[in-house]
């Protein structure tokens, strides 16, 4: 389980739009799929398919789905209480330093180096040095353009909060 | 009274584990995620883990990733730290905070426990 | 992961001064940003969220400000029961990620 998770942007509820109103909050609190109103009286239900909101809240605004890039697959659609999941496409992965892009895995090891991971959505591939077996984190020439890797780094984005 | 509670530290070797709880009162349990966060004797605050409101997800630190498990019981009001294959820089007090979900942020917390002392020491 | 640097690290003041403490992040987190106060042998307590917004019950001499990457504690008016160790953490992403506090001392 990782621990890359970013905060995602408020989305204004469109007036217009009709809203589902709900319970009061209870304690102060709206529980997921639902944000609060203005007044703090009503639950208002979040917009299935354009944002969401994960946790128990006063948020004033649900949060706005995210849009998978080009580039990425979606795994899962943006529901109520889920923010969409999207996934970086083959032959790319997302590195917890840059989470706003997919990056080109590398193609091969640097001299003297030996593959022991596989390129993955969420890591370049893997590579150690033949005689020690430490894992390479350093400078490597120009023409193998070095992207530390990132395993364990979930489809991305996804929202967490506490 | 709204309140953490922390209990279960004490003296262990490395290597062994021990199971921290963390009791609320006064507010819904249900409804928060929770964290730990601890601090080593003068040393500063380290986010530890947290839970989802419902126990759905967990996140760690990397510094405990593969030896602590974070988990709740809802019904009884009460989160775990389960901590093994303890070493001594994991010596520290434990707090059990609660984290907050509003409308202008995310992650703060805004409630802390007292905190329990756990020290790994042979 | 994002680093957060506070400075100075400790400090010493008279009461009634004027207390700036600074905090840095090495990436940007918009105003996701809170501060805490640790009083010695106590538990943290929550003083400011959002970079800015004061907790209920926070004293108003309190305050602060910033944005990005760079921020701000401020202390208008030094009072005995401030002294302290302050804490910044950033909250935009996990890791949660506070700074290494500043301890505040009266002269």
């Known amino acids: 389980e990782s621990a890359l998770i970013t905060q995602q942007d408020l989305a204004p509820q469109q007036r217009a739009a009709p809203q589902q109103k709900r319970s009061s909050p209870s304690e102060g609190l709206c529980p997921p799929g639902h944000h609060i109103s203005e007044d703090g009286r009503d639950c208002i239900s979040c917009k299935y398919g354009q944002d969401y909101s994960t946790h128990w809240n006063d948020l004033l605004f649900c949060l706005r789905c995210t849009r998978c890039d080009s580039g990425e697959v979606e795994l899962s659609p943006c529901t109520t209480t889920r923010n969409t999941v999207c996934q970086c496409e083959e032959g790319t992965f997302r590195e917890e330093d840059s989470p706003e892009m997919c990056r080109k895995c590398r193609t091969g090891c640097p001299r003297g180096m030996v593959k022991v991971g596989d390129c993955t959505p969420w890591s370049d591939i893997e590579c150690v040095h033949k005689e020690s077996g430490t894992k390479h984190s350093g400078e490597v020439p120009a023409v193998e353009e070095t992207v530390t890797s990132s395993p364990g780094t979930p489809a991305s984005p996804c929202s967490l909060s506490g | 009274q709204v309140q953490l509670v922390e209990s279960g530290g004490g003296v262990v070797q490395p290597g062994r584990s021990l199971r921290l709880s963390c009791a609320a009162s006064g507010f819904t349990f249900s409804y928060y995620g929770i964290h730990w966060v601890r601090q080593a004797p003068g040393k500063g605050l380290e986010w530890v883990a947290v839970?989802?409101?419902?126990?759905?997800?967990?996140y760690y630190a990397d510094s405990v990733k593969g030896r602590f498990t974070i988990s709740r019981d809802n019904s009884k009001n009460t989160l775990y730290l389960q901590m093994n294959s303890l070493r001594a820089e994991d010596t520290a007090v434990y707090y059990c905070?609660?984290?907050?979900?509003?409308?202008?942020?995310?992650?703060?917390?805004?409630?802390w426990g007292r905190g329990t002392l756990v020290t790994v020491s042979s | 992961d994002i680093q957060m640097t506070q400075s100075p690290s400790s400090l010493s003041a008279s009461v009634g001064d004027r207390v700036t403490i600074t905090c840095r992040a090495s990436?940007?987190?918009?105003?996701?940003l809170a501060w805490y106060q640790q009083k010695p042998g106590k538990v943290p307590k929550l003083l400011i969220y959002?970079?800015?917004t004061l907790q209920s019950g926070v004293p108003s001499r309190f305050s602060g400000s910033g944005s990005g990457t760079d921020f701000t504690l401020t202390i208008s008016s030094l009072q005995p029961e401030d002294v302290a160790t302050y804490y910044c953490q950033k909250y935009n992403s996990a890791p949660l990620t506070f700074g290494g506090g500043t301890k505040v001392e009266i002269k």
């Open positions: 905070a609660r984290g907050r979900y509003s409308s202008s942020s995310w992650w703060y917390f805004d409630l």
């Open positions: 959002a970079a800015s």
């Open positions: 990436q940007g987190i918009s105003n996701y």
């Open positions: 839970i989802w409101y419902d126990g759905s997800n967990k």
